[in-house]
Interface confidence: medium
């Protein structure tokens, strides 16, 4: 058992059928001695009398808000969550296996440049009696200070029958050096708690690995005379780490005929131009990526042919 | 070239060559052997390899005020990655194929480190771990492992070299 | 002449965990590879996982994958293997063993782990 | 994984004799990266041969080992009182090591 916060504990389960389960002695927070009785969540039904009190925890029935009273007022509460773990692994029922970059991702984090601030956000098909704290560290032997905000209610998805949702928080690296070679990985921890149930959340990562530019901006197409030709030009986005002499992104110009069958014309560039033919009904789209280290690339941005 | 007495290298060229590692970093990568390797974490525990770190003058700022400290750092590392990628990690079973992205990998690190030291002029250079012959599995570990962090490391150094080659040059 | 010495043997409830430790002297503690073998009572030899000291970089057998925890302290040439999540069936011997180029050449003593309710 | 699968389970001989024991694998073994190891009741393994025929320091000339790809053998060419116990082959050509499950030689 473990102190998650103040007056709520963690017991950690072996969970199978017939586990001996956890004993847990709960002490009431009281210079009182005597006539001190122990109630279990909104039952008035006595559990025991004394400072003390020892159960053994076995399941969920065995969770929720012990208070201890006398003679009519309320002296402390303790709230025991369960923590499950099952053939060796601890639970992972709250979260949504995103199985995206690979299976068991139930965290996903990107940033948008390298000043250290970063987005992580998680799924959940439960939407009541939820919450999340999220606490975030440069290394984990020595750790240097994340400062993350709380987590929100970011989007909700019709899948199927079922309703998803999808939450989010901002971190922010407390002394960033963005022009750095990343050493020590970015260590994100959430803790997730629905009901009675506990369960923690994990995810390691360098910053270059989840860069994930925002899409170039000012698209523009501007026609060359007698010719099918235009220049298409672009602008990095606002997002991006200066100075762009030194944080340089690469970009990808596609031209896309209306269906989705006709053969895509690409062209790789470091420029923030590029001389394509316009087909009729296509449109133009350009994406952009670090150019010296292959994280994600950006959404597309575009415009039309006519 | 970077010579005593802290004048320019020959930016345009390490801007170049640096681009050049970068790409022959990432297609090395998955061809470091028959990758069967579970994607671990990032541990901490890279301590050998030396990092482009926040005071060594690699940013814009500190290329302004005087490069030759983060010049002496990335020639550093790359001394230290050639070895590397000469050492019977790379060399030894199973073996990569002789032109492989791997071979001019190490043929270009070497380039780019001769273009920032001149016959001469020494640096002081990193001590490189000497590692007994090893096995397969601790040589696929290692070219992984090594490769991975040699992109992060060529990612820095083009950086610079495009920065310099972009607000330094002559 | 490198010898591995182990620590003792330990008796761990289901659930719990083990960090076995394995001291080498006599030779440099960094220039090779440490591999974790174990025996269960009556079976034969099973590979767990391995280290580079030199680089901190371990490799783990898919079977244990999560479970277990190879590391090393080059200060003190000890390498360590921790064990989670006990269950009976991880009652056995564990062995660490010097790792080079010919093979498993030098072994610890062996420590027994009893895993018992 | 690389499965390794020795035969026969148990050889039982006489002192003098000669003992062949086989392992085969299910790919075939990078570089011959294949030793073999002997080990005693209530004792650690302890390596004979490396890189599939090379004898390990110490070790007697009567062991030798021979094979390639996928198939295999240690010789034993007289066996010794000492030399009754299990023998393992391991294969460390893959990024997971694997060993057979053994052949006990005993006395007849």
């Known amino acids: 058992i473990w102190e998650l916060k103040k007056d709520v504990y963690v017991v950690e389960l072996d969970w199978y059928p017939d586990a001996p389960g956890e004993m847990v002695v709960l002490t009431c927070d009281t210079p009182e001695e005597d006539g001190i009785t122990w109630t279990l969540d909104q039952s008035s039904e006595v559990l025991g009398s004394g400072k003390t009190l020892t159960i053994q925890v076995k399941e969920f029935g065995d969770a929720g808000q012990y208070t201890c009273h006398k003679g009519g007022e309320v002296l402390s509460h303790s709230l025991l969550l369960l923590h499950k773990k099952e053939d060796g692994i601890w639970s992972t029922d709250i979260l949504k296996d995103q199985k995206e970059p690979k299976n068991k991702t139930f965290l996903r984090c990107e940033a948008k440049n390298y000043s250290g601030r970063f987005t992580c956000w998680w799924l959940t098909t439960i939407s009541t009696d939820l919450t999340f704290s999220v606490k975030s560290s440069r290394g984990s032997s020595d750790p240097q200070g994340v400062t993350c905000g709380a987590a929100t209610l970011s989007a909700e998805r019709v899948r199927g029958d079922n309703k998803e949702y999808e939450y989010s928080v901002e971190c922010q690296e407390d002394s960033a050096c963005p022009a750095a070679e990343e050493s020590l990985p970015i260590e994100v921890m959430v803790d997730a708690v629905h009901k009675l149930k506990y369960e923690n959340y994990t995810s390691s990562f360098f910053i270059r690995d989840i860069i994930k530019p925002d899409p170039p901006k000012n698209l523009q197409l501007k026609p060359l005379k007698n010719s099918r030709q235009v220049e298409v030009s672009w602008e990095y986005p606002d997002t991006w780490s200066t100075p762009h002499s030194y944080f340089s992104l690469t970009f990808c110009v596609q031209v896309q005929g209306k269906s989705k069958r006709e053969k895509k014309d690409r062209v790789f560039t470091d420029k923030t131009s590029a001389t394509v033919i316009c087909r009729k009904n296509a449109s133009i789209s350009v994406r952009a990526q670090d150019r010296y280290y292959s994280s994600s690339w950006s959404e597309w941005a575009s415009v039309p042919c006519s | 070239r970077a010579v005593p007495g802290g004048s320019s290298p020959a930016w345009t060229q390490c801007q170049q060559l640096s681009q050049k590692l970068c790409t022959l970093a990432w297609s090395a990568h998955p061809l470091v052997g028959h990758m069967d390797l579970r994607e671990e974490g990032d541990e901490e525990t890279t301590n050998d390899v030396p990092h482009i770190q926040c005071g060594d003058g690699c940013d814009p700022q500190g290329l302004r005020d005087n490069s030759q400290f983060c010049l002496q750092r990335i020639h550093q590392g790359l001394i230290f990655y050639e070895k590397l990628l000469g050492s019977d990690i790379f060399t030894g079973e199973p073996s990569l194929l002789p032109d492989s992205p791997v071979a001019q990998l190490h043929a270009s690190l070497l380039g780019l480190s001769q273009l920032l030291q001149p016959e001469g002029h020494h640096w002081e250079t990193q001590q490189i771990p000497s590692l007994s012959p090893s096995q397969p599995w601790q040589r696929l570990l290692l070219r992984f492992k090594i490769l991975r962090s040699l992109q992060a490391f060529v990612a820095v150094a083009a950086r610079v070299f495009a920065h310099g080659a972009a607000t330094l040059s002559p | 002449q490198v010898q591995l010495v182990q620590s003792g043997a330990e008796v761990k409830k289901p659930g719990s965990s083990v960090k076995v430790s394995c001291k080498a002297s006599?030779?440099?503690?960094?220039?090779?590879?440490i591999s974790w073998v174990r025996q269960a009572p009556g079976q034969g030899l099973e590979w767990m996982g391995g280290?580079?000291?030199?680089?901190?970089?371990?490799n783990y057998a898919q079977k244990f994958q999560g479970r277990v925890t190879i590391t090393a302290d080059e200060s003190t040439s000890t390498a360590y293997m921790e064990l989670s999540s006990l269950r009976s069936e991880d009652t056995a011997v564990y062995y660490c063993?010097?790792?080079?180029?010919?093979?498993?050449?030098?072994w610890g003593q062996g420590t027994l782990v009893t895993v018992s309710s | 994984d690389i499965v390794l699968t020795q035969s026969p389970a148990t050889l039982s001989l006489s002192p003098g004799e000669r003992a062949t024991l086989s392992c085969r694998a299910s790919?075939?073994?990078?570089?011959?990266?294949l030793a073999w190891y002997q080990q005693k009741p209530g004792q650690a393994p302890r390596l004979l041969i490396y890189?599939?025929?090379s004898r390990a320091t110490g070790v007697p000339a009567r062991f030798s080992g021979s094979g390639s790809g996928t198939d295999f053998t240690l010789t034993i060419s007289s066996l010794e009182p000492e030399d009754f116990a299990v023998y393992y082959c391991?294969?460390?050509?893959?990024?997971?090591?694997?060993f057979g499950q053994g052949t006990k030689v005993e006395i007849k």
């Open positions: 280290i580079i000291p030199m680089f901190g970089y371990a």
């Open positions: 790919q075939s073994v990078l570089g011959n990266y």
């Open positions: 391991q294969q460390y050509s893959h990024i997971s090591l694997t």
């Open positions: 063993a010097r790792d080079i180029y010919a093979g498993m050449d030098v």
């Open positions: 006599g030779g440099t503690f960094s220039n090779y590879a």
């Open positions: 890189g599939a025929s």
